[in-house]
Amino acid sequence: LIQERRSHQNNPAAHLTGANSSLTGSGGPLLWETQLGLAFLRGLDYHDGALVANKAGYYYIYSKVQLGGVGCPLGLASTITHGLYKRTPRYPEELELLVSQQSPCGRATSNSRVWWDSSFLGGVVHLEVGEEVVVRVLDERLVRLRDGTRSYFGAFMV
Amino acid sequence: LIQERRSHQNNPAAHLTGANSSLTGSGGPLLWETQLGLAFLRGLDYHDGALVANKAGYYYIYSKVQLGGVGCPLGLASTITHGLYKRTPRYPEELELLVSQQSPCGRATSNSRVWWDSSFLGGVVHLEVGEEVVVRVLDERLVRLRDGTRSYFGAFMV
Amino acid sequence: LIQERRSHQNNPAAHLTGANSSLTGSGGPLLWETQLGLAFLRGLDYHDGALVANKAGYYYIYSKVQLGGVGCPLGLASTITHGLYKRTPRYPEELELLVSQQSPCGRATSNSRVWWDSSFLGGVVHLEVGEEVVVRVLDERLVRLRDGTRSYFGAFMV
């Protein structure tokens, strides 16, 4: 029983939450809260929006983003892409891991220009020590953050 | 190997399924089937719609609800909120953990009055012994529960 | 620590990805890539679209499918069903495990007839040795595969 408990306590896991500072508008990935409220890191590191593996292995990684808007201004993309991407020293570019495309503006109608939609991604990927995972949303202007419960990012070793 | 198998057998996990009795109409959380069919509890308890932790630690909690309706009698502006909430003796009110908002009525078209949508939530949260997690949907009458495969609620320790 | 690492290395897990050959049009389940790119099998087998358990226990199984189309041709169902199903020698028919219904065509608008939607399923189920899990989508013609990051199927023991 001691062994089993120790195993759980050491198992890498993290849950990061959305915050006002998450949307940078710089073309970079979303940034996340790592300590306050529901957010935590256990056996994983965080750096500039990325979860960083300290231990090689397979991880279930996940992210949810809350999308919302008022109608669909022409300046905004009618397709929203939400993805988890890997950064590794072995490649110069980010590697797509898990991606979703949605057309949420179809939910805005003549009667109701306000719309809400949610995108969830989760899957098992292999990470080497030092490899990073980030979340990107295009167009990030449609991400609604509020209080950390609607948009988040996490992982745990399986 | 014996140690590893024992570890899995003891790891808290649960999967609860929707049933005809899930919608109380009382303003409380959804209720769930805990034994029949695909439903089970292993190292977690159940009480009035809540999964109750018997062991402190980080849990991946998840819920899916199948939403559906015929047209949009409440108006196309209607927003459905699906959330996982924590009950703890340390606070008088439920704490939001993971929440989604959707505007599914935008899916009803002139070609199709009947619409279906699905909301999935999952994330890692910390639970102390005795703390509870419940699922709420507003408006719960738009949740399809009948067969247990379309709306469900579960957790496992990570 | 050696014990803990061994436990992780032996823990059954898999992540299978969509490929050009995934959609058979034969009425069978979706087929998956098991080795290339992000795909892997560890302690689970694969057979004709199915993940096959080598070890009895509870598994978190998941699947995401990327849906997309141009408008809603009358020949296509306005409701799309995405499900995970169990095959077992104990029953002649597949057993529904986790299912979603969506009406994505409502996302096509006057501004943009092209629509995208995504369906994610995940939950804990019990598998005996030799039992299989498959993914089905009706109408599969609306599944968009591309590169393995948008439609996928996986599992790990909990």
């Epitope: - | 559906g68 015929v70 047209g71 009698p73 199709s112 009947v114 949740v143 399809r144 | 009358l74």
Partner: antibody
Framework: QVQLQESGPGLVKPSGTLSLTCAVS?????????WNWVRQPPGKGLEWIGE???????NYNPSLKSRVTMSVDKAKNQFSLKLNSVTAADTAVYYC??????????????WGQGTTVTVSS | AIQLTQSPSSLSASVGDRVTITCRAS??????LAWFQQKPGKPPKLLIF???DLESGVSSRFSGSGSGTDFTLTISSLQPGDFATYYC?????????FGQGTRLEIK
């Protein structure tokens, strides 16, 4: 248990306006339902006229749309139908019906007994 | 508008018989189909919704099947109270439409 009861004049003159009311008892009109009107000419089949929700959203049969108005009176827990410019072809038994619009249960499960309307001078 | 064609338009059967009525839609309606029973001077009564779901309180002798364009209502063992007119109805798209009806008579 919800019950519906139609009321209104049984005789309407050609080119006049047919006005019917459906009283809802045993439940609130402010629920996730569509409140429908369906008619049945003598010896013939059923024809859907239209629907209204408690929030006043309406959908009408295109074949009648230019002549139909439906509304809801939440205070009185009733809904109504107005059909103008009537002719003999509008002679029928008029039913009000509740259609459930929730996720688990669909269908027009509650009907009024029907009221016969004759268009004649 | 979606047209629903019922067949047969009428049929004669005896108590205890198994009877099948079909309804064909002019385009796909998924499972958004209901079946009603109507007796003279009475309003229609909902029997089946969502193509195959039995309405509460309705005898299990009634069953529905089908999806897309072809649907069936089956009465497994006719009882005296089953002789009536049966209508299918699609609620998938506007306008809601009904089949022309099938009159079930005693042989």
């Amino acid at each position: 248990q919800v019950q519906l009861q139609e009321s209104g004049p049984g005789l309407v003159k050609p080119s006049g306006t047919l006005s019917l009311t459906c009283a809802v008892s045993g439940g609130s009109i402010s629920s996730i339902n569509w409140w429908n009107w369906v008619r049945q000419p003598p010896g013939k089949g059923l024809e859907w006229i239209g629907e209204v929700s408690h929030s006043g959203i309406t959908n009408y049969n295109p074949s009648l749309k230019s002549r139909v108005t439906m509304s809801v009176d939440k205070a009185k827990n009733q809904f109504s139908l107005k059909l103008n410019s009537v002719t003999a072809a509008d002679t029928a038994v008029y039913y009000c019906a509740r259609e459930r619009a929730v996720a688990d249960y669909h269908g027009m499960d509650v009907w009024g007994q029907g009221t016969t309307v004759t268009v004649s001078s | 508008a979606i047209q629903l064609t019922q067949s047969p338009s009428s049929l004669s059967a005896s108590v205890g018989d198994r009877v099948t009525i079909t309804c064909r839609a002019s385009q796909g309606i998924s499972s958004a189909l209901a079946w009603f029973q109507q007796k003279p001077g009475k309003p229609p009564k909902l029997l089946i919704f969502d193509a195959s779901d039995l309405e509460s309180g309705v005898s299990s002798r009634f069953s529905g099947s089908g999806s897309g364009t072809d649907f069936t209502l089956t009465i497994s063992s006719l009882q005296p109270g089953d002789f009536a007119t049966y209508y299918c109805q699609q609620f998938n798209s506007y306008p809601i439409t009904f089949g022309q009806g099938t009159r079930l008579e005693i042989k």
